[in-house]
Interface confidence: low
């Protein structure tokens, strides 16, 4: 029976992921019952990715490690639409680390997942980045210009945003 074997495969995949995420929330993609896309509970989903807002305050290093333990990375923002989705889940009085850093302090910004840094798709606050010693990026809210990015010292603890690809079962 086709449906039975598909269900068995799904269950074995779910067991495989359980070591990282005890609970997954899955939805059917389109009209085809064969394709389910899942995010860990209580992560949120947008397009082909899952997002988790980590409210623990940690350095950039520890924030990235925290994401990687969950099979994710600090968030890489590729589009305005993606950022608009993410900010719906953020608190205005907090700052959140992004997966964007400038390790050499030479304004050579790099995303953690190796996505090329594209100056045309950046959302820096006006006047930012502004300090060569501030080598990690956060997203925060400024009343004058709403949500945008700022460079800060990497060791200063902040909240963070993790992102991972959806799990397809």
């Amino acid at each position: 029976n086709f449906m039975y074997s598909k269900t068995v495969k799904r269950l074995s995949k779910l067991r495989e992921y359980q070591q990282y995420h005890p609970s997954l929330t899955c939805v059917m993609e389109g009209k085809d019952i064969e394709d389910w896309s899942c995010c860990p509970t209580p992560w949120t989903s947008f397009q082909s990715s899952c997002y988790f807002i980590s409210t623990g305050m940690q350095s950039w290093t520890k924030s990235q490690k925290n994401c990687s333990v969950m099979g994710a990375d600090l968030v890489v923002i590729n589009t305005r639409e993606e950022q608009d989705f993410i900010i719906q889940n953020l608190k205005r009085n907090s700052s959140y680390f992004l997966g964007l850093s400038d390790p050499g302090g030479r304004r050579h910004w790099q995303w953690v997942d190796q996505t090329p840094y594209n100056e045309n798709v950046t959302f820096w606050h006006s006047g930012e980045p502004n300090n060569l010693d501030e080598r990690c990026a956060i997203i925060n809210f400024r009343s004058s210009e709403e949500w945008g990015w700022n460079d800060i010292h990497c060791h200063v603890p902040q909240k963070s945003i993790c992102k991972m690809k959806k799990i397809y079962i």
């Epitope: 050499g104 050579h108 953690v112």
Partner: nanobody, 123 residues
């Protein structure tokens, strides 16, 4: 598929030198970085040094600064770790790694690892 192959490990007396090599095949890391990590028996793997592939910028852990030098040869797709004034506490398996600079330097993690080469420093 990325493959990293280390060589150059061995047994050396305290105060001596060794040069490790790591040959990269399968892809180049362009604007990313190559690094060395080490793992002593019973301890966690720790970051040693990294070099940014395009700019040549180097990064070291404090305990090896002034003694170890990392470099890369773009034409040969190889990264080197010159280790001088070796100490018994440098004894470990040394692993080559390649990844985004921020991941190597800040997070001390990588998605790409070599098999490792043993370095033993006797007193």
């Amino acid at each position: 598929q990325v493959q990293l192959q280390e060589s150059g490990g061995g047994l050396v007396q305290a105060g001596g030198s060794l040069r490790l090599s790591c040959a990269v095949s399968g892809r180049t890391f362009s604007s990313y970085a190559m690094g060395w990590f080490r793992q002593a028996r019973g301890k966690e793997r720790e970051f040693v040094a990294a070099v940014e592939w395009s700019s040549g910028s180097t990064f070291y852990t404090d305990s090896v600064k002034g003694r170890f030098a990392i470099s890369r040869d773009i034409a040969k797709n190889t990264v080197y770790l010159q280790m001088n004034s070796l100490k018994p506490e440098d004894t470990a398996v040394y692993y080559c790694a390649g990844d985004h600079t921020g991941k190597l330097v800040f997070s001390k993690t990588s998605d790409y690892w070599g098999q490792g080469t043993q370095v033993t420093v006797s007193s």
